[in-house]
Structure formats: structure tokens, C-alpha cells
Interface confidence: low
């Protein structure tokens, strides 16, 4: 159930409405729960979760990752730079979340929920960053050809790609969650 729609919220009409920050916080936690469910299916289906980090690092995926220069860590924290990085990163992850859509059997709905919830999260964050103009949107043509390339991989590489996307997205969201709590 997406944040704000669980029975606790419905049963508590006198509860204070969530602040913008609380909504974002709850949204990220909801997506992280979804990723956990998807990772469970991936790990049960293949042995990718046991693959060494070194082997996984040799992939050629250009997945968004937090770095010191992005200003999202406690060391060198910069609110504006970090917010731009979070939104840009989430926009870049969208093509990978689209790729995940046909990769699950029992968790098909969960994969869709993660994708849709991420779109909502981006909207929340764009409202928060309405005065920032440094946000670049990925090129649709580039995304379309990347998606075609990923879907043309052999089964083993597709399993590897799925695992890497989930792991990287989880790490990116965790870093984002921490940073957003400072804003």
C-alpha cells in the first residue's frame, strides 16, 4: 500500500497531515521496502546475490552513484548540490526501473509499484527544488537505445543487470534518505 493510504492514516482523522519532508521520507522508505521484496525474488531465482563485488564491478552499467563531490555526505554536505544530484540520479534510474518491469514473475506488481512510487518521489522533490535549474533530464532517444541493448543481453547478463540495478538503487536511496533528513 503506498504511503498515506494505509489503514492507520484512515483511522486517525485528527492526526496532523504529513509535512513535505515526512512525505518524502515515507515515500523513500516505501520504495526501499519494495526493493527488498524484489531482491528477495532475484536472490531466490539466481546466485547473483553471492557474486563477489569485484565481479559485479566489471559490468558496464552507468548506474547513478553518490560521490563526495555531490555534497550529500556529512563530510562536505551542500543542500543545493545534493538535491540536484538526488533528482538527477532518480531521473537517470527511471530507464533502469523500466527495464525491471518484465524481469519478475511473482513480484510483477511490486516492480510496478517501485517504478510508480519513484515517479511520485521525483515530483515531490522537484517541488522542493523549484528554484534549482541545474537539473538535467536524460535524453529519451539515448534511454530507448539503452533499454533495447539491456533487453538483448543473454539470460545470465540480464540476471546480473537486475541484481545490480536493485543493489545500486537501494544504495542511492539510502544515501538520499540520509541527506534529505538534513534539509
Amino acid at each position: 500500500v503506498p504511503p498515506g493510504e494505509d489503514s492507520k492514516d484512515v483511522a486517525a482523522p485528527h492526526r496532523q497531515p504529513l509535512t513535505s519532508s515526512e512525505r518524502i521520507d515515507k515515500q523513500i522508505r516505501y520504495i526501499l521496502d519494495g526493493i527488498s521484496a524484489l531482491r528477495k525474488e532475484t536472490c531466490n531465482k539466481s546466485n547473483m546475490c553471492e557474486s563477489s563485488k569485484e565481479a559485479l564491478a566489471e559490468n558496464n552499467l552507468n548506474l547513478p552513484k553518490m560521490a563526495e563531490k555531490d555534497g550529500c555526505f556529512q563530510s562536505g554536505f551542500n543542500e543545493e548540490t545534493c538535491l540536484v544530484k538526488i533528482i538527477t540520479g532518480l531521473l537517470e534510474f527511471e530507464v533502469y526501473l523500466e527495464y525491471l518491469q518484465n524481469r519478475f514473475e511473482s513480484s510483477e506488481e511490486q516492480a510496478r509499484a517501485v517504478q510508480m512510487s519513484t515517479k511520485v518521489l521525483i515530483q515531490f522533490l522537484q517541488k522542493k527544488a523549484k528554484n534549482l535549474d541545474a537539473i538535467t533530464t536524460p535524453d529519451p532517444t539515448t534511454n530507448a537505445s539503452l533499454l533495447t541493448k539491456l533487453q538483448a543481453q543473454n539470460q545470465w547478463l540480464q540476471d546480473m543487470t537486475t541484481h545490480l540495478i536493485l543493489r545500486s538503487f537501494k544504495e542511492f536511496l539510502q544515501s538520499s534518505l540520509r541527506a534529505l533528513r538534513q534539509m
Epitope: R29, F73, Q74, S75, G76, Q174, R178, A179, R181, Q182
Partner: antibody, heavy 122, light 109 residues
Framework: EVQLVESGGGLVQPGGSLRLSCAAS????????MSWVRQAPGKGLEWVSA????????SYADSVKGRFTISRDNAKNTLYLQMNSLKPEDTAVYYC???????????????WGQGTQVTVSS | QSALTQPSALSVTLGQTAKITCQGG??????AHWYQQKPGQAPVLVIY???SRPSGIPERFSGSSSGGRATLTISGAQAEDEGDYYC???????????FGGGTHLTVLG
Amino acid sequence: EVQLVESGGGLVQPGGSLRLSCAASGFTFSSYAMSWVRQAPGKGLEWVSAINSGGGSTSYADSVKGRFTISRDNAKNTLYLQMNSLKPEDTAVYYCAKEGDTGWKDPMYDYWGQGTQVTVSS
Amino acid sequence: QSALTQPSALSVTLGQTAKITCQGGSLGTRYAHWYQQKPGQAPVLVIYDDDSRPSGIPERFSGSSSGGRATLTISGAQAEDEGDYYCQSADSSGNASVFGGGTHLTVLG
């Protein structure tokens, strides 16, 4: 290698004062929030106080509020805990802990000192 | 400052799986972190951010969190895993840190 070394513990009478120090090395001290955590004999861990990287923001457990003061000297790479109006229930090993590269409002402690014993007794 | 609740003790046979739980209101919106402490020693971080493992911590340690309950799992417990385990989180306001009461893990056999 990260090192945290506490000092300043000892035996003090109820109502007395002590100042604990924690000398830090092996990391950029001024970039990280720090905390004090204590452990009474045979008991669990209890968070005492935290201070952000610049020293401008502090936080305290209800049990020590108004009696303890946390501070830091980034030039000396040292964390302090000034303890006043000490009570027997403050008897514990006091650990200095470095917060991981996290948000100040969502701390975890990736490095700990070995602790310094504080005994409050008449 | 809201409390986190852990079972006070747990026994596990050598090589079996141990699951230590931690419950508390703030865990619904805050991360859970886990520490191992052996007698006379300082605590050591074994899991952070619900399910992330610091470098140097064996792969048998894993964590999960859902709906206000965090779980530390030790798959194939070893004799050296015996000790006290504490969960920790921030309170709901984020202004204070909170520890669970600790769970003493005994590895039998």
C-alpha cells in the same frame, strides 16, 4: 587507522564534577558528528549526548539534560563531556563514538573508543 | 525518548541460524543499526541502515527491517559470535539516539 582514546574518568563523590576527553586521530575530526555513550555495570548501552561536526548543534538524553555539556575543539581533534552534579546512577564506562558518514539526525557509530570508567560514590 | 525492545537472551546451536529482533515505534521511519559487544570490549558495528554490512564483518551477518521491527540474522553461528547484541536507532524526532536493552547470544556445542 581511526583511533579514539578517552581519558578523565575516575572516582568522584555525589554532587561532584568530572571532565572527560576523547582524543581522535586517523580521520578528519572536523567533518564528523560525535557522541558519548555509557554503560553501567552489567547493563546495556545508553546514549548520552551528541554534537555535530561544527559544534553548533548538541543533543542530550533526558537523564543528563542540564547537568552534562558536550563540546569539541576541532583544532585539537578532541571531544569533551563536562559532567556536573554527578549522581550514583551516572556510574558507568563512558565511550566516545564517531558517527558514520551519515546524516546527523540518523546516526550510527562506526568507531568506538575503549571507554573510561566513571564511579560516583561516597 | 522511545525505547527499543529486544529479547534479553537467545541460544543457538553451533552452525545454526540465530535471529535477534528489535521492536520500537521509531523503526517505522528510522534506520536500525546493530552492534556486537564482547566482555570487556567496546561495541562493534555489524549492520547499519537496516541491512548494510560494514567491510570486515563476515557475510553470515545480515539485517532486515519491516513495519517497526528490525531483525539481525546470523546464518551459521560460530563460537566467536557469542556476546551481547544491541540494536540502535534515532528517536522519531531524530534528536536523540536510542539503544535496545541488548540480547545475550549463547552459541551451544
